[in-house]
């Protein structure tokens, strides 16, 4: 997932549930037992800090060693710090685990900026605020890294929740979630509610607050409002989806929809920003600038570099447009749209100005590897990764940050023709090049 623009990890302090819930859809297919309902023990099990990732507590080894692990739907390795590092408070000590097994194999994962490398093994793993199970899983013990761990982020490893095809060193290394489903009765599904605070949090506030929920094996009704809308997983590697239309304040960008998915579109909790292909980014920024033209902002702001500050409490949310992404629906010629607010794509940044100011970074950026629906998107929604049915569901998050005039939305159906043509077919190349361009 994207280092250098690692995600917002903030708590749900700023977003209250949106009042009365709409009645549940009545035409849903029956679910297998345990897939829906209340998962009290897993609610609020994520924490984190703006721009630095959402993490869950996990235990590894016997006796159990507790670590905070970044939840990353954009990669497929379970990898943990296993040697001292200036940015780590603690690390996995294999020699102290009686259940550790060495696979006698190394792994090297380069990113565009930074890398990690380590030694592969297996050990017993559990999630204290997750299902009451223990599984033997593959673990990459990180022995060396560069620009991977983040100072002050409070996580010591990464949980790659995507598919085996993008696992390193190759697709024979079973990802954690596959092991979990194989070894237990946990249904092949998880859901994420990432809660942006809407304002920066200092370290102590982060540690004392909630960053969201990872519901393993099910869907929790209390975490969303309205209906869940599903889009097909196009291919099981990343969580790849197809975007069929993009609107800024209701104005269609009017691009060939293939451009929106060039060379892919993925849902990635390990990336901070909404990242868009170059042409799409340029068109989107032009449209956002036009919509907010009563005020002008420096060029560096639109590059995600300079911060714009307003006196505390006076951020002019109303001048910034909403952004709608239309996703392919489950039914032929049917799509639905997810709409985010500036409260999602303007990311509050802590520790830069005085308490008199609210300062923000523009959290939409340019990509050379396709669209990445990072935390900027996910913080607006409850996102269901329904691996069993090869689909991803979106509903309005009960914790998303909004104002009295606008809220994030998930709406449909819309009639959209020839949606299959929106997918880009990546030419077959050496798979070892797949993950190296993710900065």
């Amino acid at each position: 997932t994207q280092h250098g623009i690692r995600l917002p990890l903030r708590s749900g302090l700023g977003g209250a549930p949106l009042g009365l819930r709409l009645p549940r859809e009545t035409d849903e297919e029956p679910e297998e037992p345990g897939r829906r309902g209340s998962f009290v023990e897993m609610v609020d099990n994520l924490r984190g800090k703006s721009g630095q990732g959402y993490y869950v507590e996990m235990t590894v080894g016997s006796p159990p060693q507790t670590l905070n692990i970044l939840v990353d739907t954009g990669s497929s390795n379970f990898a943990v710090g296993a040697a001292p590092h200036p940015f780590l408070h603690r690390y996995y000590q294999r020699q102290l685990s009686s259940t550790y097994r060495d696979l006698r194999k190394g792994v090297y994962v380069p990113y565009t900026q930074g890398k990690w490398e380590g030694e592969l093994g297996t050990d017993l793993v559990s999630i204290p605020h997750g299902p009451n199970v223990t599984v033997r899983a593959n673990i990459a013990a990180i022995t060396e890294s560069d620009k991977f761990f983040i100072n002050g982020s409070n996580w010591e490893g990464i949980l790659g929740l995507a598919y085996a095809e993008i696992a390193r060193p190759d697709d024979s290394l079973e990802p954690f979630f596959d092991s979990l489903v194989k070894q237990t009765h946990v249904p092949n599904l998880f859901s994420l509610q990432l809660c942006g605070a809407g304002f920066p949090l200092n370290q102590s506030e982060v540690l004392a607050s909630v960053g969201g929920s990872m519901i393993i094996g099910g869907i929790d009704h209390s975490l969303y409002t309205g209906s869940l809308w599903y889009t097909p997983i196009r291919r099981e590697w990343y969580y790849e989806v197809i975007i069929v239309r993009v609107e800024i304040n209701g104005q269609d960008l009017k691009m060939d929809c293939k451009e929106y998915n060039y060379d892919k579109s993925i849902v990635d909790s390990g990336t901070t920003n909404l990242r868009l292909p170059k042409k799409v980014f340029e068109a989107a920024v032009k449209s956002i600038k036009a919509a907010s033209s009563t005020e002008k902002f420096p060029d560096g702001f639109w590059l995600g570099e300079q911060l714009v500050c307003w006196q505390a409490g006076t951020t002019p949310w109303n001048i910034f447009p909403v952004i709608s992404l239309y996703l392919m629906g489950e039914v032929t010629n049917q799509s639905f749209r997810i709409t985010i607010l500036p409260q999602q794509y303007l990311r509050p940044v802590e520790d830069v100005a005085t308490s008199q100011d609210d300062c923000y970074k523009f959290a939409i950026s340019q990509s050379s590897t396709g669209t990445v629906m990072g935390a900027v998107i996910m913080e607006g929604f409850y996102v269901v990764f329904d691996r069993a049915r090869k689909r991803i569901g979106f509903a309005v998050s009960a914790c998303h940050v909004h104002d009295e005039f606008r809220t994030a939305a998930v709406e449909g159906p819309f009639v959209t023709l020839d949606m299959e043509d929106c997918g880009y077919n990546i030419p077959q190349t050496d798979e070892s090049t797949l993950m190296t361009g993710r900065a």
Partner: antibody, heavy 120, light 108 residues
Framework: QLQLQESGPGLVKPSETLSLTCTVS??????????WGWIRQPPGKGLEWIGN???????YYNPSLKSRVTISVDTSKNQFSLKLSSVTAADTAVYYC????????????WGRGTLVTVSS | EIVLTQSPATLSLSPGERATLSCRAS??????LAWYQQKPGQAPRLLIY???NRATGIPARFSGSGSGTDFTLTISSLEPEDFAVYYC??????????FGGGTKVEIK
């Protein structure tokens, strides 16, 4: 070429309101490429940013002065103005108007400045 | 608040010498930093923007470098007209609000 010229009284009494105008000549204040700003410099001291304005009327102020500052624009006269209320001797300074260019980030053109003394 | 600290406060040099002025930010400002020159009785003039880009009409003897928290303005060979006060300014936080305290370059 574009020039900026500050004008206004050089002496203001304590508790009164300081009023200055900056006239833009040789170009249009309505250019979408610039903000316009005020900066001041107390005698023998450093520079202090006061605030900016865009031709649309959108303003940004220094938080430490915000409660006393108003910046306005008159596109028909190609001018923008500064009002600073409830002045004290600490507001005695050379007041500069300037253009914020280079992607709205840097003061790339300045007026010559006008000294305003606050004294009874 | 980002604080810019300039050093030295005063630099005493002779014409033809090399001048090296420092500006340190209390936290990273990326490359969003400018240098201004102010001569007595005159308005400041933009010399360098984005840490290293010379503004229009600025002689090549002026150069800027640095990023993050440490920045340097170098005048490769001082001319008589270069004796002045130099200010740095960060615009990482916008609108631009913070200037350094200044460095006076005087004739030795």
């Amino acid at each position: 070429q574009l020039q900026l010229q500050e004008s206004g009284p050089g002496l203001v009494k304590p508790s009164e309101t300081l009023s200055l105008t900056c006239t833009v000549s040789g170009g249009s204040i309505s250019s979408s490429s610039y903000y316009w700003g005020w900066i001041r410099q107390p005698p023998g001291k450093g520079l202090e940013w006061i605030g900016n304005i865009y031709y649309s009327g959108s303003t940004y102020y220094n938080p430490s002065l915000k409660s006393r500052v108003t910046i306005s624009v008159d596109t028909s006269k190609n001018q923008f103005s500064l009002k600073l209320s409830s002045v004290t001797a600490a507001d005695t300074a050379v007041y500069y108007c300037a253009r914020l260019g280079h992607g709205y980030s840097y003061f790339d053109l300045w007026g010559r400045g006008t000294l305003v003394t606050v004294s009874s | 608040e980002i604080v810019l600290t300039q050093s030295p406060a005063t630099l005493s040099l002779s014409p033809g010498e090399r001048a090296t002025l420092s500006c340190r930010a209390s936290q990273s400002v990326s490359s969003y930093l400018a240098w201004y020159q102010q001569k007595p009785g005159q308005a400041p003039r933009l010399l360098i923007y984005d840490a290293s880009n010379r503004a229009t009409g600025i002689p090549a003897r002026f150069s800027g470098s640095g990023s993050g928290t440490d920045f340097t303005l170098t005048i490769s060979s001082l001319e008589p007209e270069d004796f002045a006060v130099y200010y740095c300014q960060q615009v990482y936080l916008w609108p631009p609000r913070t200037f350094g305290g200044g460095t006076k370059v005087e004739i030795k």
